[in-house]
Amino acid sequence: TPEVWVQVRMEATELSSFTIRCGFLGSGSISLVTVSWGGPNGAGGTTLAVLHPERGIRQWAPARQARWETQSSISLILEGSGASSPCANTTFCCKFASFPEGSWEACGSLPPSSDPGLSA
């Protein structure tokens, strides 16, 4: 069964800046990746970025840079300033859609006790 992993890291240089990394562990080719915060995209979460392997990347504030790391993993950097900036207990979710197999999603957040730069 395919799985999704999520890592959330707070940048040491900017304490309110986050890096989210997500990956898909499965055999299907990825058609779309959706990154959201505040919960899964279908349960009240807000979309931060949508990554399509052919048609490009769309991102919304406070997302600063979304990119493909491999064919089955992505990363997203969030800006740390402003009213819409994330806090330490924010939940981030990644949903990987593979055709015709379907979609798999997982969520993660920064561990409460973690130091800046530590992976979740």
């Epitope: 779309l32 048609r55 859609a97 979609s103």
Partner: antibody
């Protein structure tokens, strides 16, 4: 304008074969996943077979596995369904449909359908 | 397989009144739910995708809502041209499955 035009339907005896075709125009065919959906007279919708844009993955309804083969020719902007060992229960209107990745794989455009009648 | 169960099977509503069609999934389908309208002798047409997003050209009297396993299609003010069969559809997990359809008529 997106257009999907099916052809190849008709009357065939049980055990016979048909090859359905779907000619696509008005969009970059090679970038989209495609499906065949059927509807028996007075009945609901049933996904028969699907193929992803890069022809890596396919799906078949359990009752047609081993009898039907989906294929596509991206150079000819065409989708096909080879149907062998046809049964009376395969009688239906067969629709060609396009899936939109950005819409959660919803089928955003459909052809008018081609009627397949399996009867002796 | 994920089973999509629509209710009611048929519905009669007066012109200008609200019509509500429900769809229940046998397990969570995230937000990968679409609604289609099919008129006699025509192919289905996409109305709603991602639970609540209207497809291009769809009148704003059509709206979708729900999450997880329970979803609703609402027509706020029924028009004569809305007479059709409506299907919900999940594309969350293969095999994609449809509801059995709800026939909407004018009372």
């Amino acid at each position: 304008e997106v257009q999907l035009v099916e052809s190849g339907g008709g009357l065939v005896q049980p055990g016979g074969s048909l090859r359905l075709s779907c000619a696509a125009s008005g969009f970059t065919f090679s970038s989209y996943h495609m499906s065949w959906v059927r509807q028996a007279p007075g009945k609901g919708l049933e996904l028969v077979s699907a193929i992803n844009s890069n022809v890596i993955s396919t799906y078949y309804l359990d009752t047609v596995k081993g009898r039907f083969t989906i294929s596509r020719d991206n150079a000819k902007n065409s989708l096909y369904l080879q149907m062998n060992s046809l049964r009376a229960e395969d009688t239906a209107v067969y629709y060609c449909a396009r899936h939109e990745d950005y819409y959660g794989f919803a089928m955003d455009y459909w052809g008018q359908g081609t009627l397949v009648t399996v009867s002796s | 397989d994920i089973v999509m169960t629509q209710s009611p099977d048929s519905l009669a509503v007066s012109l200008g009144e609200r019509a509500t069609i429900n769809c229940k999934a046998s397990q969570s389908v995230s937000n990968d739910v679409a609604w289609y309208q099919q008129k006699p002798g025509q192919p289905p047409k996409l109305l709603i995708y991602y639970v609540s997003h209207r497809f291009t050209g769809v009148p704003d009297r059509f709206s979708g809502s729900g999450s997880g396993t329970d979803f609703t299609l609402t027509i706020s003010s029924l028009q004569a041209e809305d007479v059709a069969v409506y299907f919900c559809h999940q594309a969350y997990r293969s095999p994609w499955t449809f509801g059995q359809g709800t026939k909407l008529e004018i009372k």
